[in-house]
C-alpha cells in the first residue's frame, strides 16, 4: 500500500482543503472511525487500485486516525494496512469529545491502559489530573492516545491552556472490577408470578468442582426456611446446578432472590440477584399513549402500535366498529402481538394500502381471567387535495366569475392569486393573492361540503372581478395536510374578442 | 467549568403544563445518562425520572408515570422534563443532574452517582 | 419499590465530634449505594458511590461502609461546613431511591 502524503503524522490548517491519496494491488479503501467516508475509488490501466479521500472545510474534529486498507483481503495479506494521524489545531475545539464506552475504564487485573484524552494541536502541553485536583501527575502523554500508564480506582481529568483558556476534560472514571474464578448465573422460570403459584429459581456455576451454594431471599429474613435441591447437570462437565422453589407463593415473598456461590479451596466467591414480583392477582397495563385521534393517508400502508405489560399473557383482539377484525386474506389486514420481554407485549395492526372504508373507530382490546383493558381511537383517512374544475364566465351583471371545485381531507384551505403582467408574473414578480376583505375589486364566496360516503371535504370557491381591464391569470390552489394542487385559467376583459 | 442551569419553572394552576429545560456545558453531553430530581418546600429528595445517553431508554417514579415525560436534545446539549396534568404535591425545586451510569459490563451494571447538578428551578401547582 | 430509611432523623453535634448516620434498604442493594450532603438552598453534592467510593473532591474525614441492606455514613471529625442534611440514595435497574434524609445541626 502507498499513501501519499506519507505521514505518519500530518498538521493541517482548520478550514482547508486537504486530499489523501491510497494505491495499491487490489481495491483500496480509506477508514475513519471504523467507517469509510464518501471517496473515490479508481483503477488504473496497470491493475493498480486507488481511493482518493478528500477533506473539506477542515475542522479540529477531523483530527484523528485514518487508515487505508485492502477493500477485499483474500488472498492478500489481511493486516496489511497503512496509519495515517492528522491534526487539525482548532481554538474551538478544547479535548476531542469521547463516547460513554471511553470515559468509564474497567480493568480485570492490574494492567497499563490509556486514558484517551486528545486534543487538536500537537504543540499542546497536556497535564493530568485527579478529577478535583491540581497536582499534575508524573505520567507520559501521547497527543495521538493520550496518558498511558498504571492507574488506581480513582477519577481522572486531562488540563491544556489554549491561548488563555484553561481547559478541562470530561472525567475518565478508571474502576477495578473484582473478578472471580467462580462464574455465576441465576434464572427464573418466570420472574412475574400471582399468589398461589410457584416461584423457581437456578443457579448454575460452572467449572468447579465442589461449591457451597447460599441463597437469601425474602421468606428467609421472616425465619421461614426453604430447603434448595442441588445437582449436577452431568451432559456438562462440572455445571452444578441449585434450584430454590417455593410453592404457593404469597405476596410477601417479592423481592430479590441472591444466590452466593463460595469455593473454599482458593477461597473464590460470587454472588447473583434477580428480581422476584408476586402479584396480587394478573395484570394488564397500557404503556406510553396513544392519541385518540389517528391519521392515515389514502394508499399508503400505516401501522398502528399498542405497547402493554400483562401477566399472564393476554387474548389480543382489535376490533373496527364493533366488530371483530382478523388477519384478511387478500393481505389488506396484519394483526400481530409480540412478546417483547417476559411481561411486555406490543401489538400491531397494520393496514395495507390504505382505503378510505377503513377509516373509522378502532379498539384493542387485551385481556385474561384477571383483567383487562382496552385501547381505542379514531382513523381519520387523510386524502391528498385535487382541483376537480376551474372554469371562467362572466354573467349578464358585467362582473366576471371564476369558480373553483376540490376535494380532500382534511378540509383543504384555498388560496387565490392573480398575475395582472403576464410576461414578469409569476417568474419575476409574485403573484397577487385574491379575495382578501379589503380588496374592493374582486369578492370572494366559498361553499364547504363533506361527502359522508367518500369521507372527504368538497370546496366551492367562487371569485367574483368587478373590473377586468387586460388579461389576468387567475390561480387557485388547494392545500390540506397531505398535499396541494394549482389550475389556473385566463380571463379576459369582456371588450377582447379572443381568449388565450 | 461543568456546568447544568435549569429553567422554564414558574406558577401553574392544577392540571396545567410546562417545560423545564437544562442546559448543559463543560463536558461531553451526549455521553451520559441524565437524571431529573426534585425537591418539594421543605422535604427531602426524590428522583423524578432519567435518560439514557441517546434517548432510547427511559425510566420513572411510579407517581409520575403518565403525566411527566423527559427527553434531550444532545445537539443543543439540552435535557427537558415536560410536565402535564400537574397537582399540587407535583410543587416542588427541580434539579437536573448528571447520572454517571457506565456502559454495561458483561452482565453487570456500575453506577457512581450523580456527580454534577443544577441549581433548580421551581415550580409551584396552585389555584 | 425499594425503600430506604435513615437514621437518625436529626442528628445533634458538636465540631470534632465523630458522626454516624444510618441508612437501611427494604431489600439487598448488593453495594449500590450513594451518599449526598446538601445545605439550605443549595443542590446536593455527591460524596460516596458504591457505598465505600470517596468522590473526587471530597474530605478523607467521610467514609462510607456496609453492604446489603445496611450501610453508614461516618464523619471522623466534625467541621463546621459539615453541618447539613445528608442523604443515602440507592440505585437498582435505573430507578432511584433516596433516604428521608439526616439533619446534622449544632448541638
Known amino acids: 500500500l502507498v499513501v501519499t502524503p506519507p505521514g505518519p503524522e500530518l498538521v493541517l490548517n482548520v478550514s482547508s482543503t486537504f486530499v489523501l491519496t491510497c494505491s495499491g494491488s487490489a481495491p483500496v479503501v480509506w477508514e475513519r472511525m471504523s467507517q469509510e467516508p464518501p471517496q473515490e475509488m479508481a483503477k488504473a490501466q496497470d491493475g493498480t487500485f486507488s481511493s482518493v479521500l478528500t477533506l473539506t472545510n477542515l475542522t479540529g474534529l477531523d483530527t484523528g486516525e485514518y487508515f487505508c486498507t485492502h477493500n477485499d483481503s483474500r488472498g492478500l495479506e489481511t493486516d496489511e494496512r497503512k496509519r495515517l494521524y492528522i491534526f487539525v489545531p482548532d481554538p474551538t475545539v478544547g479535548f476531542l469529545p469521547n463516547d460513554a464506552e471511553e470515559l468509564f475504564i474497567f480493568l480485570t487485573e492490574i494492567t497499563e491502559i490509556t486514558i484517551p484524552c486528545r486534543v487538536t494541536d500537537p504543540q499542546l502541553v497536556v497535564t493530568l489530573h485527579e478529577k478535583k485536583g491540581d497536582v499534575a501527575l508524573p505520567v507520559p502523554y501521547d497527543h495521538q492516545r493520550g496518558f498511558s500508564g498504571i492507574f488506581e480506582d480513582r477519577s481522572y481529568i486531562c488540563k491544556t491552556t489554549i491561548g488563555d483558556r484553561e481547559v478541562d476534560s470530561d472525567a475518565y472514571y478508571v474502576y477495578r472490577l473484582q473478578v472471580s474464578s467462580i462464574n455465576v448465573s441465576v434464572n427464573a422460570v418466570q420472574t412475574v408470578v400471582r399468589q398461589g403459584e410457584n416461584i423457581t429459581l437456578m443457579c448454575i456455576v460452572i467449572g468447579n468442582e465442589v461449591v457451597n451454594f447460599e441463597w437469601t431471599y425474602p421468606r428467609k429474613e421472616s425465619g421461614r426456611l426453604v430447603e434448595p435441591v442441588t445437582d449436577f447437570l452431568l451432559d456438562m462437565p462440572y455445571h452444578i446446578r441449585s434450584i430454590l422453589h417455593i410453592p404457593s407463593a404469597e405476596l410477601e415473598d417479592s423481592g430479590t432472590y441472591t444466590c452466593n456461590v463460595t469455593e473454599s479451596v482458593n477461597d473464590h466467591q460470587d454472588e447473583k440477584a434477580i428480581n422476584i414480583t408476586v402479584v396480587e392477582s394478573g395484570y394488564v397495563r397500557l404503556l406510553g399513549e396513544v392519541g385518540t385521534l389517528q391519521f392515515a393517508e389514502l394508499h399508503r400502508s400505516r401501522t398502528l402500535q399498542v405497547v402493554f405489560e400483562a401477566y399472564p399473557p393476554p387474548t389480543v383482539l382489535w376490533f373496527k366498529d364493533n366488530r371483530t377484525l382478523g388477519d384478511s386474506s387478500a393481505g389488506e389486514i396484519a394483526l400481530s402481538t409480540r412478546n417483547v420481554s417476559e411481561t411486555r407485549y406490543v401489538s400491531e395492526l397494520t393496514l395495507v394500502r390504505v382505503k378510505v372504508a377503513e377509516a373509522g373507530h378502532y379498539t384493542m382490546r387485551a385481556f385474561h381471567e384477571d383483567a383487562e383493558v382496552q385501547l381505542s381511537f379514531q382513523l381519520q383517512i387523510n386524502v391528498p387535495v385535487r382541483v376537480l374544475e376551474l372554469s371562467e364566465s362572466h354573467p349578464d351583471s358585467g362582473e366576471q366569475t371564476v369558480r373553483c371545485r376540490g376535494r380532500g381531507m382534511p378540509q383543504p384551505n384555498i388560496i387565490w392569486s392573480a398575475c395582472r403582467d403576464l410576461k414578469r408574473c409569476p417568474r419575476e414578480l409574485p403573484p397577487t393573492l385574491l379575495g382578501n376583505s379589503s380588496e374592493e375589486e374582486s369578492q370572494l364566496e366559498t361553499n364547504v361540503t363533506y361527502w359522508e360516503e367518500e369521507q372527504e371535504f368538497e370546496v366551492v370557491s367562487t371569485l367574483r372581478l368587478q373590473h377586468v381591464d387586460r388579461p389576468l391569470s387567475v390561480r387557485c390552489t388547494l392545500r390540506n395536510a397531505v398535499g396541494q394542487d394549482t389550475q389556473e385559467v385566463i380571463v379576459v376583459p369582456h371588450s377582447l374578442p379572443f381568449k388565450v | 467549568e461543568v456546568q447544568l442551569v435549569e429553567s422554564g419553572g414558574g406558577l401553574v394552576q392544577p392540571g396545567g403544563s410546562l417545560r423545564l429545560s437544562c442546559a448543559a456545558s463543560?463536558?461531553?453531553?451526549?455521553?451520559?445518562?441524565m437524571s431529573w430530581v426534585r425537591q418539594a418546600p421543605g422535604k427531602g429528595l426524590e428522583w423524578v425520572a432519567n435518560?439514557?445517553?441517546?434517548?432510547?431508554?427511559?425510566h420513572y417514579v411510579d407517581s409520575v408515570k403518565g403525566r411527566l415525560s423527559i427527553s434531550r436534545d444532545n445537539a443543543k446539549k439540552s435535557l427537558f422534563l415536560h410536565m402535564n396534568s400537574l397537582r399540587a404535591e407535583d410543587t416542588a425545586v427541580y434539579f437536573c443532574?448528571?447520572?454517571?451510569?457506565?456502559?454495561?459490563?458483561?452482565?453487570?451494571?456500575?453506577?457512581?452517582?450523580?456527580?454534577?447538578w443544577g441549581h433548580g428551578t421551581t415550580v409551584t401547582v396552585s389555584s | 419499590d425499594i425503600q430506604m430509611t435513615q437514621s437518625p432523623s436529626t442528628l445533634s453535634a458538636s465540631v470534632g465530634d465523630r458522626v454516624t448516620i444510618t441508612c437501611r434498604a427494604s431489600?439487598?442493594?448488593?453495594?449500590?449505594l450513594a451518599w449526598y450532603q446538601q445545605k439550605p438552598g443549595k443542590a446536593p453534592k455527591l460524596l460516596i458511590f458504591?457505598?465505600?467510593t470517596l468522590e473526587s473532591g471530597v474530605p478523607s474525614r467521610f467514609s462510607g461502609s456496609g453492604s446489603g441492606t445496611e450501610f453508614t455514613l461516618t464523619i471522623s471529625s466534625l467541621q463546621p461546613d459539615d453541618f447539613a442534611t445528608y442523604y443515602c440514595?440507592?440505585?437498582?435497574?435505573?430507578?432511584?431511591?433516596f433516604g428521608q434524609g439526616t439533619k446534622v445541626e449544632i448541638k
Open positions: 443532574a448528571r447520572d454517571l451510569v457506565p456502559p454495561r459490563q458483561d452482565d453487570y451494571y456500575y453506577y457512581f452517582g450523580m456527580d454534577v
Open positions: 431489600q439487598s442493594i448488593s453495594d449500590w
Open positions: 440514595q440507592q440505585y437498582n435497574s435505573y430507578s432511584r431511591t
Open positions: 463543560g463536558f461531553t453531553f451526549s455521553s451520559y445518562w
Open positions: 458504591k457505598a465505600s
Open positions: 435518560m439514557n445517553q441517546d434517548g432510547s431508554e427511559t
